[in-house]
Interface confidence: medium
């Protein structure tokens, strides 16, 4: 396959919702109409698949309705958000992006995002 | 046996239309893209269209870009190649092919199957 | 669109004799390219796939060599069921594009 450069974010901060977005971009060099970006999980030296999207140029992503994450996209451009996060998934979070079609296929793999997990300060115990 | 069976030629004026029809079997049809290739009387290979496996992504040749749509139907093993503002230069034998490419749509590595073809003058 | 110019047009040999038939992309395409042979009245038949793969069931007096821009088929030593047209396809950007053909006759 023929490769493909990809930029992410190196750090993001995740809302005490437990809530993280950040831009994957990717450098098309040619005219796709079908994009796959997949979202991977390092930590302590394993890769996990966090979720995955194919997406018709022009349209929205479409995670499947159980993933943890949302999307949109405009041009070469994804906007990812990853929901219901906890300090324990703290890691870093690579964004693929694979050009489907039309040939040639091309893959890219971003440096990946740090996104960190702060679980927030339960409610101290009320009398009221 | 691996086949591909086309049909829907015949003899039609300027400006008119056809429907090619080509028939896939002994192989999992929607595991793969397809490709209509033609070949007019004396002349060379020249690759009209392709579809990928479910149907969501096409490609023409510039020279039918806009009057020819590619389109298949997995459920049928069938694709098909919708021809409209049909021209002279468009008389040719026309060949369906299997793309031999890996999972799915991953890597195309050119077709390896044909079908026989079938006439459009 | 990638050109895809092959050469000789065509060509006079005898049984036996070794046949060297090229094709060169107008850009680099690396090794997506495909040689098939055709007999008149019949589909095209694949020999060789990624420049230099030799096709399953396809004697092995074909082969194919190449990256890049230059791509060569060589077919070892004729045969008379080899006297065909050959052409080369260009499988690495769309539209596909096939080389204009090589005609393969008895000398």
């Known amino acids: 396959c023929k490769a493909m450069h990809v930029a992410q974010p190196a750090v993001v901060l995740a809302s005490s919702r437990g809530i993280a977005s950040f831009v994957c971009e990717y450098a098309s060099p040619g005219k796709a109409t079908e994009v796959r970006v997949t979202v991977l999980r390092q930590a302590d030296s394993q890769v996990t698949e966090v979720c995955a999207a194919t997406y018709m140029m022009g349209n929205e992503l479409t995670f499947l309705d159980d993933s943890i994450c949302t999307g949109t996209s405009s041009g070469n451009q994804v906007n990812l958000t990853i929901q219901g996060l906890r300090a324990m998934d703290t890691g870093l979070y690579i964004c693929k992006v694979e050009l489907m079609y039309p040939p040639p296929y091309y893959l890219g793999i971003g440096n990946g995002t740090q996104i960190y997990v702060i679980d927030p300060e339960p409610c101290p115990d009320s009398d009221f | 046996e691996v086949q591909l069976v086309e049909s829907g030629g015949g003899v039609v004026r300027p400006g008119g239309s056809l429907r090619l029809s080509c028939a896939a079997s002994g192989f999992t049809f929607d595991d793969y893209g397809m490709s209509w290739v033609r070949q007019a009387p004396g002349k060379g290979l020249e690759w009209v269209s392709g579809?990928?496996?479910?149907?969501?992504?096409?490609g023409y040749a510039d020279s039918v870009k806009g009057r020819f749509t590619i389109s298949r139907d997995n459920a049928k093993n069938s694709l098909y190649l919708q021809m409209n503002s049909l021209r002279a230069e468009d008389t040719a034998l026309y060949h369906c092919?299997?793309?031999?490419?890996?999972?799915?749509?991953?890597?195309?590595?050119?077709?390896?199957?044909w079908g026989q073809g079938t006439t459009v003058t | 669109d990638i050109q895809m110019t092959q050469s000789p047009s065509s060509l006079s040999a005898s049984v036996g004799d070794r046949v060297t038939i090229t094709c060169r992309a107008s850009q680099g395409i690396r090794n997506d390219l495909g040689w098939y042979q055709q007999k008149p009245g019949k589909a095209p038949k694949r020999l060789i796939y990624?420049?230099?793969s030799l096709q399953s069931g396809v004697p092995s007096r074909f082969s194919g060599s190449g990256s890049g821009t230059e791509f060569t088929l060589t077919i070892s030593s004729l045969q008379p069921e080899d006297f065909a047209t050959y052409y080369c396809l260009q499988h690495n950007s769309y539209p596909w594009t096939f080389g204009q053909g090589t005609k393969v006759e008895i000398k």
């Open positions: 990624a420049a230099s």
């Open positions: 092919a299997r793309e031999d490419n890996w999972r799915k749509y991953y890597y195309y590595y050119g077709m390896d199957v």
């Open positions: 579809i990928n496996w479910n149907g969501g992504s096409t």
